[in-house]
């Protein structure tokens, strides 16, 4: 086990050292507007290289008995942009409202502006002085004041204005220590609404030319939200350029410009009155035929949780969701903690898996409705993000036992034919073929919103005989003590490198 851990660590260091140098973006501080011209962007472009290599290495390989022990079909993941040909221009002091269904690319758009996601095509123009408010509120161990000022020079008038605009005056007045009350470790626990308002106040307090607000009102009551939207976003920040990710018609009405994204493309860009004129047309185009129609509202949140938890391509960085993170992109909150992180790696989330078997395979299944999410190791079934999971369809997977065991263990069992009854029992059989299809299934009643974004032109088949004990070793871990995430990428690298 230590040997495998060491190898893994060395490989990760090596991968990191071989990555391209991070290029600091050049900004023009005199720029007053924010412009995006024909921007197209991809997440994790290096991912494509891995599969190209896998494709070459496995082109002519078959297992000894002529049967495909494990293979993937319809792997059309390459060249899928998360943003396609996006254009907009907002002048200083304008409010751009960005809306769209799940996976539309709303957070990706913000990430491109921040330089977290580099566009493969197009131009972005802004001053570079940006403040970002995530949809996941987060608190640093420290006082309320420290959490809002957050290292920026203190300005009494500005601070008081922000506190008032973010509706924090009443909350602060309840504490004897006022804004010097300690939060986090050894301090008081805030409600979700209080955390959200402090996170917003932090972003607003920072002096910037452009404010990126990613669904900041998600966990606020409607009265507070209305007041903050008016007093903070519309009044206090009136002379600042603001981009607000929102789903509320009320916010769209107040915005100078509206950008509606759909499957990474700009579906509408204009004013609210123009949107009103076009809305019946929108509905007729989208009703019943587009995938967002079949998804529940909690999936409105951004596809790119990954950016906020800053995983590497491997996704193996140990992260405990209950910890308070000090890095701004490892954000969790009272609500975020319970949120199932099905989209830790966005590349992994744009595909739906199905399993087809020649012979019945015993497995423990997938636990879906637990109150607290388990740490994700490897899953063949993506969650529907915030706690409601997409279960495999009956027509796709036919298994006897009730689906109720641990997600990661079930996948390990599935791949190693083991049955978990308190201990791992391994048995080997070659009769079973496991087919993992990464393209949308024609017989599914609900098309995955991400699958619809995949091109269906290229296919990739990987046939590989796997040493089960090696695989077991590779995935062996202690659920209690190692909160690591082993992604599909890691597994694929494993089967590519460790050839039998």
């Amino acid at each position: 086990q230590t040997w495998y851990d060491s190898l893994g660590a060395i490989n990760k260091i090596q991968d990191f050292l071989q990555k391209q140098e991070y290029k600091t973006l050049e900004y023009n501080l005199t720029t007053t507007e924010v412009v995006m011209e024909n921007v197209t962007a991809f997440w994790e472009e290096g991912f494509g290289e891995l599969f190209e290599k896998a494709k070459q290495n496995n082109n002519n390989r078959k297992t000894s008995n002529g049967d495909d022990s494990l293979f993937f079909s319809n792997f059309s993941l390459l060249g899928t942009p998360v943003l396609k040909d996006i254009n907009f221009k907002i002048e200083r002091g304008q409010l751009l409202a960005v809306a769209g269904s799940t996976g539309a690319g709303k957070t990706s758009l913000l990430m491109v502006i921040m330089g977290e996601l580099e566009p493969s095509e197009g131009k972005i123009k802004h001053s570079g002085r940006i403040s970002f408010c995530s949809q996941f509120s987060w608190i640093m161990p420290g006082t309320i004041k420290e959490n809002i000022i957050f290292g920026v020079s203190y300005d009494e008038y500005r601070y008081r204005s922000v506190i008032k605009a973010c509706q924090l005056e009443e909350d602060i007045s309840k504490f004897a220590e006022k804004d010097n009350i300690v939060l986090g470790e050894g301090g008081i626990t805030l409600s979700g609404g209080q955390r959200a308002r402090i996170s917003l106040a932090r972003a607003v307090y920072k002096d910037a030319d452009l404010y990126l607000l990613d669904s900041p009102f998600g966990y606020l009551d409607v009265l507070t939200e209305k007041e903050i939207f008016e007093s903070c976003v519309c009044k206090l920040m009136a002379n600042k350029t603001r981009i607000l990710v929102t789903s509320k018609m009320e916010h769209l009405k107040k915005a100078d410009k509206i950008l509606i994204l759909h499957e990474g493309s700009s579906y509408f860009y204009g004013t609210f009155s123009e949107l009103q004129n076009l809305q019946p047309d929108f509905s007729s185009k989208l009703m019943g035929c587009d995938s967002f129609d079949q998804f529940s509202a909690e999936r409105r949140n951004s596809i790119l949780t990954e950016t906020l938890h800053r995983f590497s391509l491997e996704g193996d960085a140990p992260v405990s969701w209950t910890e308070t993170k000090k890095q701004s992109f490892k954000q969790t909150g009272e609500f975020g903690e319970k949120r199932k992180n099905s989209i830790l790696n966005p590349i992994n989330s744009i595909r739906k898996f199905s399993i087809v078997q020649k012979t019945p395979l015993q497995m423990n299944g997938i636990e879906e409705d637990s109150d607290e999410p388990l740490e994700r190791r490897l899953s063949l079934v993506p969650d529907s993000e915030q706690g409601e999971a997409i279960l495999p369809r009956i027509s796709v997977i036919s298994t006897g036992p009730t689906l109720q065991a641990r997600r990661r263990q079930s996948v390990l069992n599935l791949m190693t034919h083991s049955v978990n009854q308190g201990q791992n029992i391994h048995r080997k059989t070659t009769a079973s073929t496991r087919k993992v299809s990464l393209a949308p299934q024609a017989n599914l009643t609900e098309l995955d919103i991400y699958s619809r974004r995949l091109s269906q032109e290229t296919g990739l088949e990987i046939s590989e005989e796997i040493n089960e004990e090696d695989l077991k070793e590779c995935f062996f871990d202690d659920m209690e003590s190692i909160p690591a995430v082993t992604t599909w990428n890691t597994y694929l690298r494993y089967i590519t490198v460790h050839k039998s």
Epitope: G218, H262, Y267, A297, Q386
Partner: nanobody, 123 residues
Framework: QVQLQESGGGLVQAGSSLRLACAAT????????MGWYRQAPGKQRGMVAI???????DYADSVKGRFTISRDNAKNTVYLQMNSLKPEDTATYYC?????????????????WGQGTQVTVSS
């Protein structure tokens, strides 16, 4: 046409319990946050409790530990279990929901309010 209808209000004695329910009906595609708000005579309307689609909750300090909000997504219904009621809980209780109508693309939501149900707690 979307409508919210509250039920369960009434006159009770201090220390007793009540359960409010609010059902959303009409051409509903999805519902995001739902919540309960109250307005006592001569006072502003204020939040009592809210619940997100996946069940995360937030409460006003005055009701924490006594009131519990829950929802049934399948029935488009939100509930408020009120225990250990106090005279100061007397108010008209309003239900709120962020609803995407069937005719709305892209999960664009609007705010909807119920007519309110009266809760009176006598000492």
């Amino acid at each position: 046409q979307v409508q919210l209808q509250e039920s369960g209000g009434g006159l009770v004695q201090a220390g007793s319990s009540l359960r409010l329910a609010c059902a959303a009906t009409g051409s509903i595609r999805s519902i995001n946050n739902m919540g309960w708000y109250r307005q006592a005579p001569g006072k502003q309307r204020g939040m009592v409790a809210i619940i997100t689609r996946v069940g995360n909750t937030d409460y006003a300090d005055s009701v924490k530990g006594r009131f519990t909000i829950s929802r049934d997504n399948a029935k488009n219904t939100v509930y408020l279990q009120m225990n250990s009621l106090k005279p100061e809980d007397t108010a008209t209780y309003y239900c709120h929901a962020e609803i995407t109508e069937q005719s709305r693309p892209f999960y664009l939501t609007d705010d909807y309010w119920g007519q309110g149900t009266q809760v009176t707690v006598s000492s």
